[in-house]
């Protein structure tokens, strides 16, 4: 019961996390710039992974994609890649974990298969969460190291004076969404891995041996106890009776009134 709860909770937490990673990746507010007052209207600039937006005090918002930019830094491309990898891994993990859920019956799927699938999805969620956290952290580091404060400089060109508008880049909402979502996906993945341990059938140090008598009279040879319990030298459960003792792996079940287990 606890295993099912852990697995289910892990799935739900990961689902919320991956939804958050998708939301963060699509959001425009990865970096925001201090609102500056133009004599005409107050302008608020913010930028995402895919486009840059401007919001005016009137409420008008205009966004433009980065395809017109001449040079996108490799770091931005790396962040994009990390977030997409995180989403893809998370989506695959979700798909696998749906079939791995203990509460869902699919044919005659064994617990060992479900345990393997749970572990696989758990690992995928962990990697997905790490990708998201890494992507957001790299972006945050870019803001802090390179673009936190743009220098106000002036130069005079052919067309008059050009002045850099003093803007301070601050962390946008998407960064916080990404960190939280990545963390949730990571936690969900860990929970799935924990649930996997409970799902896996416990391996014992012996294998059950069933005895099928070949005739009406059953002759037990000395040493049978040792052989059947794994205490003797015959730990591999080799056949020791000519009378038809077989390991569980070899046994073929023929219903008979002479079967003894």
């Amino acid at each position: 019961m606890a295993v099912t709860a852990c697995q289910g909770l892990g799935f739900v937490v990961s689902l919320i996390g991956i939804a958050g990673i998708i939301a963060a990746t699509c959001m425009d507010q990865w970096s925001t710039q201090d609102l500056y007052n133009n004599p005409v209207t107050a302008v608020f600039n913010y930028q995402g992974l895919w486009r840059s937006c401007v919001r005016e005090s009137s409420g008008f918002t205009e966004c433009r994609g980065y395809f017109t930019l001449l040079g996108l830094p490799a770091m931005l491309q790396a962040v994009r890649a990390l977030m997409i990898v995180g989403i893809v891994l998370g989506a695959i993990g979700l798909l696998v974990s749906i079939f791995a859920l203990k509460c869902i019956r699919i044919g005659s799927m064994e617990d060992s298969a479900k345990a393997n699938m749970t572990l696989t999805s758990g690992i995928m969620f962990i990697v997905s969460g790490l990708c998201a956290i890494a992507g957001v952290s790299v972006f945050a580091n870019m803001l802090v190291t390179n673009f936190w404060m743009s220098t106000a400089n002036m130069y005079t060109g052919m067309g008059g004076m050009v002045q850099t508008v003093q803007t301070r880049y601050t962390f946008g909402a998407a960064l916080f969404v990404g960190w939280v979502a990545g963390g949730l996906t990571l936690i969900g993945g860990v929970m799935m891995c924990i649930a996997c341990r409970g799902l896996a059938p416990e391996e014992t140090n012996y294998k059950a041996v069933s005895y099928h008598a070949s005739g009406h009279s059953v002759a037990y040879k000395p040493g049978g106890f040792k052989a059947s319990t794994g205490f003797g030298s015959n730990t591999k459960n080799k056949k020791i009776y000519d009378g038809g003792a077989r390991t569980e792996d070899e046994v073929q079940s023929y219903p008979s009134k002479h079967d003894y287990v």
Partner: nanobody, 123 residues
């Protein structure tokens, strides 16, 4: 390099009309606000009219009802239609734009000024 080039200035009689144009060129990602400023001899530079990307406009009280500002976003061009011109409108008219350069990321915002065009209202 981003630059603004004004045109359309000249000598006009009081009560006459003029249309100023300002073309933005260079590596422009987007333009937020475009404005017209003027500076009369011996006076401070003042805002005449401005227009945002969303169409929000602002006019100086002295030109309200006489001047009309407009912009063509596709051409990155700003216009100022000046009607009922008076002698006190004589000044050098400067084009100003708050724009984003397309040469870097994150997008860098610049305040760019044109070299100015002289408008003389005299009989």
């Amino acid at each position: 390099e981003v630059q603004l080039v004004e045109s359309g200035g000249g000598l006009v009689q009081p009560g006459g009309s003029l249309r100023l144009s300002c073309a933005a060129s260079g590596s422009i990602f987007s333009i937020n606000v475009m404005s017209w400023y003027r500076q009369a001899p011996g006076k401070q530079r003042e805002l005449v009219a401005g227009i945002s990307a969303g169409g929000t406009t602002r006019y100086a009280d002295s030109v309200k009802g006489r001047f009309t500002i407009s912009r063509d976003n596709a051409k990155n061009t700003l216009y100022l239609q000046m009607n009922s011109l008076r002698a006190e409108d004589t000044a050098v008219y400067y084009c100003n734009a708050d724009l984003a350069e397309a040469t870097s990321w994150p997008v860098r915002y610049l305040e760019v000024w044109g070299q100015g065009t002289l408008v003389t209202v005299s009989s």
